[in-house]
């Protein structure tokens, strides 16, 4: 671990901020798990920097990350999924900074998909449905979903609804008539596993019906 003292680049490197963050994705590719890490500071010179994870692995001491542009990435079946691993930023054999992380507490689910909205004329409501790959998984099965919707003209006025199922009913009377709405959904682990919100699903756009003047109800699209 010595032998670098005369290396001016390394001495400079030790003054830098190598703080980093990571997230895990379980069964992201069949039975393979992934771990992704990146530096908090986008200006860090990553030329000679490597990431390594040691501990809480199956029948190996350590694994090295692959570098993909600005991120570092591992895909493996060898996570024990219990206890803390030691994740280190390294230059050669020297560790610059390390963090002990339990991979089950930094899980980022895959984004939901197939989001759609169907208007039910008789019920005067909108049925929102979406899908998640996590229904088929062995580990991160229980998720909390965050459905966010807004009137397209209201840039930052999102309304959020949390739910554990993949179906939501929006009452017509709670929405503006004859308006275009944008809706999207994301997920977070909600049982045993902990972590971060997934990326947002692709947005879905729908229009609310006009108000029928005689009855005060909206016309269907």
């Amino acid at each position: 671990e010595s032998g670098y003292a005369q290396n001016g680049d390394l001495e400079d490197a030790e003054l830098d901020d190598y703080s980093f963050s990571c997230y895990s994705q379980l069964e992201v590719n069949g039975s393979q798990h992934s771990l992704t890490c990146a530096f908090e500071d986008p200006d860090v010179n990553i030329t000679n920097l490597e990431f390594e994870i040691c501990g809480a692995l199956v029948e190996v001491k350590c694994l090295n990350f692959r570098k993909l542009q600005e991120i570092y990435f591992i895909e493996t079946k060898k996570f024990l999924l219990i206890g803390k691993s030691n994740i280190c930023v390294k230059v050669g054999e020297k560790s610059l900074t390390c963090k002990k992380i339990d991979l089950t507490t930094i899980v980022k689910p895959e984004a939901p998909f197939d989001l759609s909205v169907v208007y039910r004329e008789g019920a005067n409501d909108f049925v929102v449905t979406f899908n998640t790959s996590h229904l088929q998984k062995k580990y991160v099965k229980v998720l909390m979903h965050d459905v966010a919707y807004r009137q397209e003209k209201d840039e930052n006025k999102w309304t959020h609804v949390n739910l554990s199922s993949t179906k939501l009913t929006l009452l017509q009377r709670k929405l503006q008539p004859a308006a275009m709405y944008e809706i999207k959904v994301r997920s977070i682990p909600d049982h045993y596993f902990k972590g971060f919100w997934s990326e947002w699903s692709p947005s879905y756009y729908f229009r609310t019906p006009e108000i029928n003047n005689s009855s005060g109800e909206m016309d269907p699209i």
Partner: antibody, heavy 119, light 105 residues
Framework: QVQLVQSGAEVKKPGASVKVSCKAS????????MNWVRQAPGQGLEWMGL????????SYNQKFKGRVTLTRDTSISTAYMELSRLRSDDTAVYYC????????????WGQGTTVTVSS | EIVLTQSPATLSLSPGERATLSCSAS?????MHWYQQKPGQAPRPLIY???KLASGIPARFSGSGSGTDFTLTISSLEPEDFAVYYC????????FGGGTKVEIK
């Protein structure tokens, strides 16, 4: 209090198999690894393998791979170690030990199970 | 696989004396643990992660070291400290040293 209670002593013939149990109490069984360590008479300690009780994932010492099988029954908070194709040099005390997942040391040990292999 | 060599194999000391036990690794180890074992008993943890005292362990026990060289020190031996001591690496395959027996002189 946290406790690991192992099954009783066994006498086996060469070529046979032995299955040792380890019942955990006083903590959440699925929250810690269960490790197995053996000690031959007058010798040091040798780690054999571990199991993650939450998902059944195992990690074995290469020396024992193929001969040792670790399993668990979460409904009764019990871990099992089965060693097959027994030889006389498998005569030892077999310990189960809870693994502390923050620091990876064995913080709680069973009382040990003596396995004697003799023809 | 890392080999842990403990020295001396036997340490003969009197109660009240200071005991210094060494554990040398064949390659660099991030963390080291220490256990005590008495005849007919299971091992019990003494020191984890190089220098942290396990639950219920008296302060006369201390650990130090880094890289390939680690030390367990007992500042003043009590009668109940005469036992065998093992070092162990924190990572797969969780190798133990051969042990140091601390006996009464």
């Amino acid at each position: 209090q946290v406790q690991l209670v192992q099954s009783g002593a066994e006498v086996k013939k060469p070529g046979a198999s032995v299955k040792v149990s380890c019942k955990a109490s006083g903590y959440t069984f699925t929250g810690y690894t269960m490790n197995w360590v053996r000690q031959a008479p007058g010798q040091g300690l040798e780690w054999m393998g571990l199991i993650n009780p939450y998902n059944g994932v195992t990690s074995y010492n290469q020396k024992f791979k193929g001969r040792v099988t670790l399993t668990r029954d979460t409904s009764i908070s019990t871990a099992y170690m089965e060693l097959s194709r027994l030889r006389s040099d498998d005569t030892a005390v077999y310990y189960c030990a809870r693994g502390d997942g923050d620091y990876w040391y064995f913080d709680v040990w069973g009382q040990g199970t003596t396995v004697t292999v003799s023809s | 696989e890392i080999v842990l060599t403990q020295s001396p194999a036997t340490l003969s000391l009197s109660p009240g004396e200071r005991a210094t036990l060494s554990c040398s690794a064949s390659s660099s180890v991030t963390y080291m643990h220490w256990y005590q074992q008495k005849p007919g008993q299971a091992p019990r943890p003494l020191i984890y992660e190089i220098s942290k005292l396990a639950s219920g362990i008296p302060a006369r026990f201390s650990g130090s070291g880094s890289g390939t060289d680690f030390t367990l020190t007992i500042s003043s031996l009590e009668p109940e400290d005469f036992a065998v001591y093992y070092c162990q690496e924190w990572n797969y395959p969780y190798t133990f040293g051969g042990g140091t027996k601390v006996e009464i002189k």
